[in-house]
Interface confidence: medium
């Protein structure tokens, strides 16, 4: 006999970076017949939501119209149907950003390289920060961690045309704060028409300090629900 | 809706007793984590007391402990602060919440509260 259902699907739209004083929602999907939806940030009861009729209704939302950084941290969610609970969902990281000053992101040797060259960003923030982070735009965002007193670097190896896009950075002053974003950088890189049609969308990096964030769409959820449960793996954990 | 509504508190002297209520409605109340935080004139505020869904854990303030015991009832959502040996620094608005680290209203749910006077 099932003692538990299945985890719901946690997300915040339009984006778990959401900048300071701007509204973020975080949107919690279960099953349909759900009555009661928990959402819990921190380890605290934060909000709930009773849908009507709950026959009909498989995802609530939770608004936040006004993001500081005492909102910024960890959010889960579970639901019931009947007396029966759900298995709390993975843990959301709401990030509250443009928090005091902004880093300058640059790249070495250039913005446009061969492919197969060496590849380093330097993010640089003269504030108190000692953790710096990348971001590459895209359909998968892209999270590197780094370190330094006033500034991080960034090694991206030998580059292939997967590593073109735009990126940027942000100084972060604690796990869920970060600075506001630097200006974009644009890599470009060239390589044979072969390499090219062959390259995924977004290049694979190591395990260690990469995390997967999925930009958040109804479409996209509604295509692929296993896609949703990298949404709020812990970026920092 | 959730209401969470305190009741219980009121004026009494130094070294009496008092024991503190909470009726909770709107949500599944037997899995959440429960708190007492109590804010004075002038002061933060400052959780007394927390107890988890099944009442296998609850923690105390240094300030209380010995003297405050929190328990719960799920089958009747009732939340309560038995309080002895109080003293006049124990003055204060006393909350029931479901906030359990960030003290403040806009976090969670809060009672509207229920104010204890302790004066000789």
């Known amino acids: 006999q099932q003692q538990t259902l299945p985890k719901p699907f946690i997300w915040a739209e339009p984006h778990f970076m959401v900048p300071k004083e701007k509204q973020v929602t975080i949107c919690c999907q279960g099953n349909y017949g759900a009555v009661e939806y928990q959402l819990h940030f921190e380890g605290s009861l934060f909000a709930v939501d009773r849908p009507k009729p709950p026959e009909r209704i498989n995802k609530v939302q939770f608004y936040i119209p006004d993001m500081n950084s005492r909102m910024a941290g960890q959010y889960s969610c579970i639901y019931r149907v009947g007396e029966l609970w759900s298995e709390p969902s993975n843990l959301l990281d709401l990030v509250v950003t443009e928090m005091y000053d902004t880093p300058t992101l640059s790249v070495h040797p250039g913005p446009e390289v061969i492919s197969g060259e060496k590849v380093t960003f330097y993010c640089r923030l003269d504030t108190a920060t000692s953790m710096f982070l990348l971001l590459k735009e895209g359909r998968s965002s892209h999270v590197q961690r780094g370190y330094g007193k006033v500034q991080a670097e960034f090694p991206l190896g030998p580059v292939t045309t997967a590593h073109r896009g735009t990126y940027r950075c942000f100084g972060s002053y604690n796990n869920h704060a970060w600075s506001f974003p630097s200006e974009p950088v644009k890599l470009l890189v060239t390589g044979d028409i072969e390499n090219t049609s062959l390259a995924p969308e977004d290049p694979t990096f190591p395990a260690d300090t990469w995390g997967t964030y999925l930009l958040t769409t109804e479409t996209g959820l509604q295509k692929d629900h296993a896609l949703w449960d990298h949404t709020a793996q812990n970026l920092l954990r | 809706d959730v209401q969470l509504v305190e009741s219980g508190g009121g004026l009494v002297q130094p070294g009496g007793s008092l024991r503190l209520s909470c009726a909770i409605s709107?949500?599944?109340?037997?899995?959440?984590?429960m708190s007492w935080v109590r804010q004075a004139p002038g002061k933060g505020p400052e959780r007394v007391s927390w107890?988890?869904?099944?009442?296998?854990?609850?923690s105390y303030a240094d300030s209380v402990k010995g003297r405050f015991t929190i328990s719960r009832d799920n089958a009747r959502n009732m939340l309560y602060l038995q309080m002895n040996s109080l003293k006049s620094e124990d003055t204060a608005r006393y909350y029931c919440?479901?906030?359990?680290?960030?003290?403040?209203?806009?976090?969670?749910?809060w009672g509207q509260g229920t104010q204890v006077t302790v004066s000789s």
């Open positions: 919440t479901t906030q359990n680290s960030h003290y403040d209203i806009r976090f969670g749910y």
């Open positions: 107890i988890n869904g099944d009442s296998s854990n609850t």
């Open positions: 709107g949500f599944t109340f037997s899995i959440v984590s």
